[in-house]
Interface confidence: medium
């Protein structure tokens, strides 16, 4: 009679995490007498998955009734598969022996791969804000997926980015994998409303990729442009000087007026005008009492934006253009008066 063969017809099977896996095994003979055992792995570290004769294997059920006398089907079903169940499973026939059964013949093995979904991608940007024209790095991470094959793309406002590097770890066999990608993005002044998107596609997602986003509003700093202008005379001996602070982001801004280098007033931006591109404008103004000055006045608008070094713009106020009344015995008013715009 031909020697018993252990047949595992499936070289490999793939199962989604949480589902059941059926591992098929049949033998070609009832002789020799002895039990079947299932193992994960072939080497000394192999793990017993099911023993026909003894033991408790709560996740394993047999496909056929092993108590039937002529049964040759020793297929098993493993429930609630997780990535940790991945490996090669061997159906092994033992020959009855005393005191121990003797390993007689093994099947060729069935490789079980587990399909596990990647976690939602998490996108993180730089710790500190950067200004337009600078290049900043964003990272994207996703974990726990299997098999290893995965596709990651970067987008900025729907436009695919090309300057990025991606690693999938570990490099060799593992129960599950992680992906880490770093993209470089050049900032522009219009990026306050922009988004950077990391998109991950995997066989488990059935064509519906996962996305992680980062708002560039958390990364960008658009420094303001300053313009100091002198308005027409409001009243005799008074000049209105305005400082237009334009196109800045974020909102945090402090403005100081200097008169000939001396601090006159400091104020914090409050009522701001938002531009379509997400940046802000603000205006501060001074009423200058010209009659209080004998010489020309240098007015400086100094702005400290988002904790950065101050930028300033100056305006020279010509006092000689406004001759003072001779012999007036009226006490001069304050040299500088101010008002916030309504």
């Amino acid at each position: 009679e031909e020697e018993l063969q252990v047949i595992q017809p499936d070289k490999s099977i793939s199962v989604a995490a949480g589902e059941s896996a059926t591992l098929h095994c049949t033998v070609t003979s009832l002789i020799p007498v002895g039990p079947i055992q299932w193992f994960r792995g072939a080497g000394p570290g192999r793990e017993l998955i099911y023993n026909q004769k003894e033991g408790h294997f709560p996740r394993v059920t047999t496909v056929s009734d092993l108590t039937k006398r002529n049964n040759m089907d020793f297929s098993i079903r493993i429930s609630n598969i997780t990535p940790a169940d991945a490996g090669t499973y061997y159906c092994v026939k033992f020959r009855k022996g005393s005191p121990d059964h003797v390993e007689f013949k093994s099947g060729a093995g069935t490789e079980l791969s587990v399909r596990a979904k990647p976690s939602a991608p998490v996108v993180s940007g730089p710790a500190a804000r950067a200004t337009p024209q600078h290049t900043v790095s964003f990272t994207c991470e996703s974990h726990g997926f299997s098999p290893r094959d995965i596709t990651l793309k970067w987008f900025k406002n729907g436009n695919e980015l090309s300057d990025f590097q991606t690693n999938v770890d570990p490099a060799g066999d593992s129960v599950s994998y992680s992906i880490h990608s770093t993209a470089k993005v050049v900032l522009t002044r219009e990026d306050v409303h922009s988004q950077v998107i990391c998109e991950v596609a995997h066989v488990t997602l059935q064509g519906d990729p996962l996305r992680g986003t980062a708002n560039l509003s958390e990364t960008i700093r658009v420094p303001p442009t300053l313009e100091v202008t002198q308005q027409p005379v409001r009243a005799e001996n008074q000049v209105n000087v305005t400082c237009q602070v334009r196109k800045f982001y974020p909102q945090r801004l402090q403005l100081t007026w200097l008169e000939n280098g001396n601090v006159s007033r400091t104020e914090t931006a409050s009522t701001l005008t938002e531009n379509k591109d997400g940046t802000y404008n603000w205006m501060s103004w001074l009423l200058v009492n010209v009659s209080a000055h004998r010489d020309d006045v240098k007015l400086t608008c100094q702005v400290e934006h988002d904790g950065q070094p101050a930028v300033s713009k100056s305006h020279d106020l010509k006092v000689s253009a406004h001759p003072k009344e001779q012999g007036s015995n009226t006490a001069p008013g304050p040299a500088l008066a101010s008002a916030a715009p309504l």
Epitope: G43, P44, G45, E103, D173
Partner: antibody
């Protein structure tokens, strides 16, 4: 109690070669035979393992490049399509009597040279 | 793939001295103790020294000591003898059913 390799020789690239590991002096209920190679002046490189029932597994780099099988008297290693990088001394080693993955007994090795 | 990193690549010590070889695994070995140490001399096959991370193989002198668990392992050779000059390899066994070796450490006895 010993294991011994045979079949090493000079082969041209692409010519399949089968090495044999003969086990003698053992009467064991359970054992494992592994194949390990060592290129000249290099370290040890694990190829794969087979158990007494004939179930084999391989290092990921070795899958498809090597086949380990068991006959009634030997454990064979087939190099499916040798390249010059496969030039090495090939050892078979036996694990038995301990559940730790250790290779207790080693053969002297057989030299395989792959060259045009 | 699972990687075993052996350090140092080479070590020199005098007769009677002590050498320590480290073996770090990129992931935990199976059951935290599937780690063996081998000695190999030129032209010879490796010889098993220690298995199960710390158990001495038959006939190996107690001057050889293995320790460690999980991912970090050490082989210590004390009272060094000239016959201990050899290359030493660690080997791990993993849940994925592979049994790779470290890169080896050459021990030179002065």
């Amino acid at each position: 109690q010993s294991v011994e390799e045979s079949g090493g020789r000079l082969v041209t690239p692409g010519t399949p070669l089968t090495l044999a590991c003969t086990v003698s002096g053992f009467s064991l209920i359970s054992y494992y035979i592994s194949w390990v190679r060592q290129a000249p002046e290099k370290g040890l490189e694990y190829i794969g393992i087979i158990n007494i029932g004939g179930g084999a597994s391989y290092a990921s780099w070795a899958k498809g490049r090597f086949t380990i099988s068991k006959t009634s008297t030997t454990v064979d290693l087939k190099i499916t399509s040798p390249t010059p990088e496969d030039t090495a001394t090939y050892f078979c080693a036996m694990s038995y009597g301990m559940d730790t993955g250790a290779f207790n007994i080693w053969g002297p090795g057989t030299l395989v040279t792959v060259s045009l | 793939a699972q990687v075993l990193t052996q350090t140092p690549a080479s070590v020199s010590a005098a007769v009677g001295g002590t050498v320590t070889i480290s073996c770090q695994s990129s992931e935990s070995v199976y059951k935290n103790n599937f780690l063996s140490w081998y000695q190999q001399k030129p032209g010879k096959p490796p010889k098993l020294l220690i298995y199960g991370a710390s158990t001495l193989a038959s006939g190996v002198p107690s001057r050889f000591k293995g320790s460690g668990s999980g991912t970090q392992f050490t082989l210590t050779i004390s009272d060094l003898e000239s016959d201990d000059a050899a290359t030493y390899f660690c080997q791990g066994g993993y849940r994925t059913d592979i049994y790779p070796f470290g890169g080896g450490t050459e021990v030179v006895v002065k």
